[in-house]
């Protein structure tokens, strides 16, 4: 029983697992999309430098009342070391460049798949 104790208390999720789960969630969103995602809401595009997860969260957190991306918002917050609230504008956003949430999610998914393949889990 002592040996099995570790299984009972969930420890920190390995970065590779967290990234895989985020990818799976984004796959779910893109595959199950029937009506325009979040009523076709627009979000800021982002740069893909360090802090990309925070920038993605800062963009998506400004979309309210869209249950389809709530889980994604929560998952992204796990990758972002600081508190993110609506209205924040990061230098990692591309100013004057807004894209549809559906495209943002789709492109974020493509980028994360590439990171996963390259073993970049953080």
């Amino acid at each position: 029983l002592t040996c099995l104790g570790g299984f009972a208390s969930p420890g920190p999720v390995p970065p590779s697992t967290a990234l895989r789960e985020l990818i799976e969630e984004l796959v779910n969103i893109t595959q199950n999309q029937k009506a325009p995602l979040c009523n076709g809401s627009m979000v800021w595009s982002i740069n893909l430098t360090a802090g990309m997860y925070c920038a993605a969260l800062e963009s998506l957190i400004n979309v309210s009342g869209c249950s389809a991306i709530e889980k994604t918002q929560r998952m992204l917050s796990g990758f972002c070391p600081h508190k993110v609230s609506a209205g924040q504008f990061s230098s990692l956003h591309v100013r004057d460049t807004k894209i549809e949430v559906a495209q943002f999610v789709k492109d974020l998914l493509l980028h994360l798949k590439k990171l996963f393949r390259e073993g970049q889990f953080n």
């Epitope: 982002i46 893909l48 894209i99 492109d107 974020l108 493509l110 590439k114």
Partner: nanobody, 118 residues
Framework: GVQLLESGGGLVQPGGSLRLSCAAS????????MGWARQAPGKGLEWVSS????????YYADSVKGRFTISRDNSKNTLYLQMNSLRAEDTAVYYC???????????WGQGTLVTVSS
């Protein structure tokens, strides 16, 4: 929606140079591997060159190697093709396109005509 808008085409003499640009909008440009393809009059589509998302890995068709240079500026959402030592056989409509293997990530511009003639 997604838009790829090519510019820079035109008439040029053999041996001359042109620089094509492709302005991207409606998607996260820096995520995508990108490329240029061309279609000569009465011929099929030929993939000319591609560049990875970060801009540090490039590919060129043998027919343009050493003459064409592909580059990108992710901060400007723009793809470029510098074409030097142009030949009559480079005459074609040049298309900017995404170059991803993943299904559903295939986007193409409308094309810009390059005519090499004296």
């Amino acid at each position: 929606g997604v838009q790829l808008l090519e510019s820079g085409g035109g008439l040029v003499q053999p041996g001359g140079s042109l620089r094509l640009s492709c302005a991207a909008s409606g998607f996260i440009f820096a995520v995508y591997d990108m490329g240029w393809a061309r279609q000569a009059p009465g011929k099929g589509l030929e993939w000319v060159s591609s560049i990875n998302d970060g801009g540090n890995v490039t590919y060129y068709a043998d027919s343009v190697k050493g003459r064409f240079t592909i580059s990108r500026d992710n901060s400007k959402n723009t793809l470029y093709l510098q074409m030097n030592s142009l030949r009559a056989e480079d005459t074609a409509v040049y298309y900017c396109a995404t170059a991803e293997d993943e299904p559903g990530y295939d986007y193409w511009g409308q094309g810009t005509l390059v005519t090499v003639s004296s």
